[in-house]
Interface confidence: low
Amino acid sequence: LQDLCSNCPAGTFCDNNRSQICSPCPPNSFSSAGGQRTCDICRQCKGVFKTRKECSSTSNAECDCISGYHCLGAECSMCEQDCKQGQELTKKGCKDCCFGTFNDQKRGICRPWTNCSLDGKSVLVNGTKERDVVCGPSPADLSPGASSATPPAPAREPGHSPQ
C-alpha cells in the first residue's frame, strides 16, 4: 500500500486521525522535511537569547545572544558572557588576567606574555593585562651607552598555563 504521508510537503504533517490527510503545522511549530507525522515545536529565544530568524512553518527559529554574550555550540545552543580585554571567563564570572598573562580580546583566555629572553631579546614595552610584551634587540645589539627601555619580563615556568 502506498504511504500517502510521503506526499505531505514541508510545513505540513500527516494526520493519521484524518485518513493521512496533510494538515498544516499548528502555530509555533514547523516541519522542515516532507512526510513528517508530527510538527516540531519552534525554538523560543528567551532570556540571554534573542531571535535572529523567526520560526516559519518550514523552518525552526534561530537564536543569537543578547549584547554582552556570544554563542557557543551548534545552532547557538548556549550563550557565554563576554569579558573585557584583560580578563577571562571563569566559573565565577569575568576575572582579571593574572600578572604575566594577557588577553587582548573579549573572549578566550589569558595567555602568558612572550618571554623575550628565549629569543635573546629584551623587553622594549612591558606587557599589561590587555597586551603582550613587545620584544626588541638584545642589549648587546644596542649602541654603546644605550640600554633597553625596561628590564626583561620575569620568566614563567615552561608549560605553565594561566589559571
Epitope: H70, C71, L72, E80, E88, L89, T90, K91, D104, Q105, R107, G108, I109, R111, P112, R131, D132, V134, G159, S161, P162, Q163
Partner: antibody, heavy 118, light 112 residues
C-alpha cells in the same frame, strides 16, 4: 558568507622566501585572530603562529621562530604569512584559519601548496 | 609543549556502525573556567580541515548530532554514532590551551 581565500600555489628555490596571503570576507576582520597551520606530506597538521588581526601582534611556534612573520593589512582584510630560508622540508600545504570561540579554528582557507625545488 | 597522542591511527568502519577515536594529552587541558580546551577536526580528502567539536564536547554549528565528544582527565574521545560515507577522512585532535597549539598525529577513518 564568511570565508578565507588564500593565494595560489607557489614554487620556490631552496633558500628563498615565500609569502602566502589570506583574504577574509563576510565578517569583521579585526575581531578575530588569524592562525597559520601547515601540513607536509605524511605529517600531522602543524601550528605555525597567529596574529591578532585587531592590533597586529603575532606569536610564533618556536619551531619557526626567526623564519616566519605574520602580518595583516586591515584595510584589505588580509593576513600574510612570510616564511624565509626555505628548504625541501617546507614543502607543504599552508592554511590560514580564523580563531572563533575558545581557541577553535572555525573557518579555514582553502590551502596554498608551496613547493620547494632546485 | 603539550603532546597529543591519538589512537588508533587507522580505523576501518562499516557504514552505519559506530566509531570511536581516542586522544590523550601529556598535560591537563582543564582551564579554571571549567572547560577542557580540546578540539576535534575532520580533514576530508581534497578539502580544508573543518571544526567538529570544541571545548571537549561542544558541537560546532552545522555538525550532525551523530558526532559527540567526551572527556575524562587527559583522555578525550570522539564518537560517531553511525558512520556515513561522507565521514571518511583524517580526524585530528588539537589543544588550543597553550602556545604552541599542538595536534594529534591523526586517525584515518575509511569504509570497510
Amino acid at each position: 558568507q564568511v570565508q578565507l581565500v588564500q593565494s595560489g600555489a607557489d614554487v620556490k628555490k631552496p633558500g628563498a622566501s615565500v609569502r602566502v596571503s589570506c583574504k577574509a570576507s563576510g565578517y569583521t576582520f579585526t575581531s578575530y585572530p588569524i592562525h597559520w597551520v601547515r601540513q607536509a606530506p605524511g605529517h600531522r597538521l602543524e601550528w605555525m603562529g597567529w596574529s591578532n588581526a585587531g592590533i597586529g601582534n603575532a606569536k610564533y611556534s618556536q619551531e619557526f621562530q626567526g623564519r616566519v612573520t605574520i602580518t595583516r593589512d586591515t584595510s584589505a582584510s588580509t593576513a600574510y604569512m612570510d616564511l624565509s630560508s626555505l628548504t625541501s622540508e617546507d614543502l607543504a600545504v599552508y592554511y590560514c584559519a580564523r580563531e572563533g570561540v575558545a581557541g577553535a579554528f572555525d573557518i579555514w582557507g582553502q590551502g596554498t601548496m608551496v613547493t620547494v625545488s632546485a | 609543549d603539550i603532546v597529543m597522542t591519538q589512537s588508533p591511527l587507522s580505523l576501518p568502519v562499516t557504514p552505519g556502525e559506530p566509531a570511536s577515536i581516542s586522544c590523550r594529552s601529556s598535560q591537563n587541558l582543564l582551564h579554571s573556567n571549567g572547560y577542557n580546551y580540546l578540539d576535534w577536526y575532520l580533514h576530508k580528502p581534497g578539502q580544508s580541515p573543518q571544526l567538529l567539536i570544541y571545548l571537549g564536547s561542544i558541537r560546532a554549528s552545522g555538525v550532525p548530532d551523530r558526532f559527540s565528544g567526551s572527556e575524562s582527565g587527559t583522555d578525550f574521545t570522539l564518537k560517531i554514532s553511525r558512520v556515513e560515507a561522507e565521514d571518511v577522512g583524517i580526524y585530528y585532535c588539537m589543544q588550543p590551551l597553550q602556545i604552541p597549539y599542538t595536534f594529534g598525529q591523526g586517525t584515518k577513518l575509511e569504509l570497510k
